[in-house]
């Protein structure tokens, strides 16, 4: 299942948390490529068979997306070229918590990184003056 004959590229993720019912961001950056059409971004979630999101050839490719994420994901398409593969997750659910993998393929090589995503009912602390 691996890609042969390609170098590794650096992929960096940041653990984050999402508020149930709101939109969340799963952060991922990578070594950019000069050609958008050479970049493939795949987001996966442990315990989920289908893809969370896929972006390739300059656009979203949602055909192999898992049912539980349909209509709820987006990447920042205009920022992919500069190495931003972060995922926007709409209407965060409790079941969205878990381990995600940001998997990147470019003309330079491939790489991936995991991130832990927590979900809950987080509120901003009240500050009394």
């Amino acid at each position: 299942f691996g890609i042969s004959g390609r170098h590794s590229i650096t992929v960096t993720t940041v653990a984050s948390a999402g508020n149930i019912g709101e939109d969340g961001i799963l952060s991922c950056t990578f070594e950019p490529d000069i050609k958008l059409s050479d970049i493939v971004i795949q987001w996966l979630k442990e315990g989920v068979l289908g893809l969370v999101h896929e972006f390739k050839e300059g656009k979203d490719e949602l055909s192999e997306q898992d049912e539980m994420f349909r209509g709820r994901t987006a990447v920042f398409a205009d920022q992919v070229i500069v190495g931003n593969a972060s995922l926007r997750l709409k209407n965060v659910q409790l079941t969205d918590a878990g381990t995600y993998k940001c998997y990147i393929i470019t003309s330079k090589g491939k790489g991936n990184a995991n991130l832990e995503y927590k979900t809950g009912a987080f509120s901003m602390p009240e500050v009394n003056v």
């Epitope: 299942f1 691996g2 890609i3 042969s4 795949q42 996966l44 979630k45 442990e46 315990g47 989920v48 068979l49 289908g50 893809l51 949602l62 055909s63 192999e64 049912e67 349909r70 209509g71 993998k101 998997y103 393929i105 991936n112």
Partner: antibody
Framework: QVQLVQSGAEVKKPGSSVKVSCKAS????????IHWVRQAPGQGLEWMGG????????KYAQNFQGRVTITADESTSTAYMELSSLRSEDTAVYYC?????????WGQGTTVTVSS | DIVMTQSPDSLAVSLGERATINCKSS????????????LAWYQQKPGQPPKLLIY???TRGSGVPDRFSGSGSGTDFTLTISSLQAEDVATYFC?????????FGQGTKVEIK
């Protein structure tokens, strides 16, 4: 060109287990799902389950829940399907297939015969 | 689970004539955000694995002759062989991949009349 090559035919006794392998060759992503489908003699196609090799995430058909285990070894690009507590009605050809807009690449099939 | 029902179970057609196979799903296979039907058609010859003919209900697979075409949307789909050739004798299956469990139609056997 991706190819899926399966292990050879097996003859098993009722109550035993069988493990069938499916090796991927050629240039393919770790993020393609590999599915297992079986076909009893003269019958239709029955989906058993699938795996996402990069995470080892699996999903199984209700009919096989508890009896089937699908695994993958990324280092050898091989997926496995193990079926336990075999009975005569498990006699079938077992196929692995890559999911990509349907199932675009299939293994050649492995015949499993369950007989006492 | 989505139930797939094919008709007819078998079909005898003269060489050069049109063969039509129908497939009905128990729920819609159209995913509107991508405007695609998650339906595939396969051809299977004796002793061989299935071969992908059509995906997205109407897109021909790699190397599939243009006499094979798929149509339909939602719950009703059709596979058409415009001019039957001797090598088209096989069993044809529809399959939904809209959701798991993935399910197949029971198959339609195509023979020469």
């Amino acid at each position: 060109q991706v190819q899926l090559v399966q292990s050879g035919a097996e003859v098993k006794k009722p109550g035993s287990s069988v493990k069938v392998s499916c090796k991927a060759s050629g240039d393919t992503f770790t993020t393609y799902q590999i599915h297992w489908v079986r076909q009893a003699p003269g019958q239709g196609l029955e989906w058993m389950g699938g795996i996402m090799p990069i995470f080892g995430t699996t999903k199984y058909a209700q009919n096989f829940q508890g009896r089937v285990t699908i695994t993958a070894d990324e280092s050898t690009s091989t997926a496995y399907m193990e079926l336990s507590s075999l009975r005569s009605e498990d006699t079938a050809v077992y196929y692995c297939a890559r999911r990509n807009y349907g199932m675009d690449v299939w293994g050649q099939g492995t015949t499993v015969t369950v007989s006492s | 689970d989505i139930v797939m029902t094919q008709s007819p179970d078998s079909l005898a057609v003269s060489l050069g004539e049109r063969a039509t196979i129908n497939c009905k799903s128990s729920q819609s296979l159209l995913y509107r955000p991508v405007n695609k039907n998650f339906l595939a058609w396969y051809q299977q010859k004796p002793g061989q694995p299935p071969k992908l003919l059509i995906y997205w209900a109407s897109t021909r697979g790699s190397g599939v002759p243009d006499r094979f075409s798929g149509s339909g949307s939602g719950t009703d789909f059709t596979l058409t062989i415009s001019s039957l050739q001797a090598e088209d004798v096989a069993t044809y299956f529809c399959q939904q991949y809209y959701s798991t469990p993935i399910t197949f139609g029971q198959g339609t056997k195509v023979e020469i009349k």
